[in-house]
Amino acid sequence: MAVTACQGLGFVVSLIGIAGIIAATCMDQWSTQDLYNNPVTAVFNYQGLWRSCVRESSGFTECRGYFTLLGLPAMLQAVRALMIVGIVLGAIGLLVSIFALKCIRIGSMEDSAKANMTLTSGIMFIVSGLCAIAGVSVFANMLVTNFWMSTANMYTGMGGMVQTVQTRYTFGAALFVGWVAGGLTLIGGVMMCIACRGLAPEETNYKAVSYHASGHSVAYKPGGFKASTGFGSNTKNKKIYDGGARTEDEVQSYPSKHDYV
């Protein structure tokens, strides 16, 4: 039950995270005009990964796409790439995790397959979240660098007086959406990886065979071969039945009350 909850929660958290990454990538407000020097501007500028916008005194907003590919800064291209990779990995991760969900039955899929799929989707979510966080952080770093460069330029010139004040940009809403969304996707991925441990069949126990030595009543049970899953072993509450061993966390081959949600 705990495994199902962890897996389900991981899936939902990742889903929200990836939706946030997509939203952040599409948003226009990655950088917004810094209003510190001109809080009463009638013309407000903001920029996204794909276009820049200007809101005018009339309330009308005009947006123009970046129709050049080669003319764009390499950093912007890198951020775009990171966000797209994050979205693609996240989307594939979501697809894989749907089939890996313990509460969904697909034919006679084995638990080991579900465990592997859960782990795969978990890793994909982690990488997706890291891509988003990296992309947003690179953009934020670019903004900070440009901000201080334009601040330095602002106060240079003829006696510190500059008629054309360079527009400075600060963090836009999309950066915060991206950071939060990336973090959620990362957390969701970690939860999926944790759930994977509980899903994995951890031990293959053979039918107990007793060898009776004359004059002794010592039973020898060869059960020391563990199926290696790579996630360590969990030896708690192992019950040995005639039909072989099964951990309590393992799903049964016939429907239980937790199989349909």
Epitope: T41, N45, S52, E56, S58, T167
Partner: antibody
């Protein structure tokens, strides 16, 4: 076509208040900010403030801060400008202005402040 | 506040003349975000509301005759009427559309010589 129709001329006593209305037609009222500009006889045009009809947000010129209130009724596609504590120098023609590049002006409302 | 200064304050000319009037702003009206100068020119006739002629310093409003042209960037702007027509005699105002409060120039009154 896009049109702004303002209320009629007003004569007020000093210290009183005046409320001028501006009814918009021919476009979506919430698409553009509504600005108010006045012109005293023989003087230059003077911006008073604006309202964002979408959310009711306003911005006023420091000169009129505390005396001017701009409101709107989206259901009636109408904006209102109220100027309080009137003095003789407030005698002017008041215009509402909207659309992109502030291209459309109302016909103007003459407000005369006289004792 | 941005101060807008127009010159001359009045101008006498004849039909068919080419006239030029200037407008200076105390701060740049250039917006680097879209590479536009936020200066607007209006024409006003007595007893009428102002009429938009030019926005973004040089873009003619639709329906405005081609004899009207605007130029300039930053803080210095010019309105030119290439060949004066009888209906062009009016007062012309420039306006800062870049920063609040939106401010207007004192106007240039164009009179018949």
């Amino acid at each position: 076509q896009v049109q702004l129709v303002q209320s009629g001329a007003e004569v007020k006593k000093p210290g009183a208040s005046v409320k001028v209305s501006c009814k918009a037609s021919g476009y979506t009222f919430t698409d553009y900010n509504m600005h108010w500009v006045r012109q005293a006889p023989g003087q230059r045009l003077e911006w008073m403030g604006y309202i964002n009809p979408n959310n009711g947000g306003t911005s006023y010129s420091q000169k009129f801060q505390g005396r001017v209130t701009i409101t709107r009724d989206t259901s009636a596609s109408t904006a209102y400008m109220e100027l309080s504590s009137l003095r003789s120098e407030d005698t002017a023609v008041y215009y509402c202005v909207t659309t992109r590049y502030l291209a459309v002006w109302g016909q103007g409302t003459t407000v005369t402040v006289s004792s | 506040d941005i101060q807008m200064t127009q010159s001359p304050s009045s101008l006498s000319a004849s039909v068919g003349d080419r006239v030029t009037m200037t407008c200076k702003s105390s701060q740049s009206l250039f917006n680097s975000g879209n590479q536009k100068n936020y200066l607007t020119w209006y024409q006003q006739k007595p007893g009428k509301a102002p009429k938009l002629l030019i926005y973004w310093a040089s873009t003619r409003e639709s329906g405005v005759p081609s004899r009207f042209s605007g130029s300039g960037s930053g803080t210095d702007f010019t309105l030119t009427i290439s060949s004066l027509q009888p209906e062009d005699f009016a007062t012309y105002y420039c306006q800062n559309d870049y920063s609040y409060p939106l401010t207007f120039g004192g106007g240039t009154k164009l009179e018949i010589k």
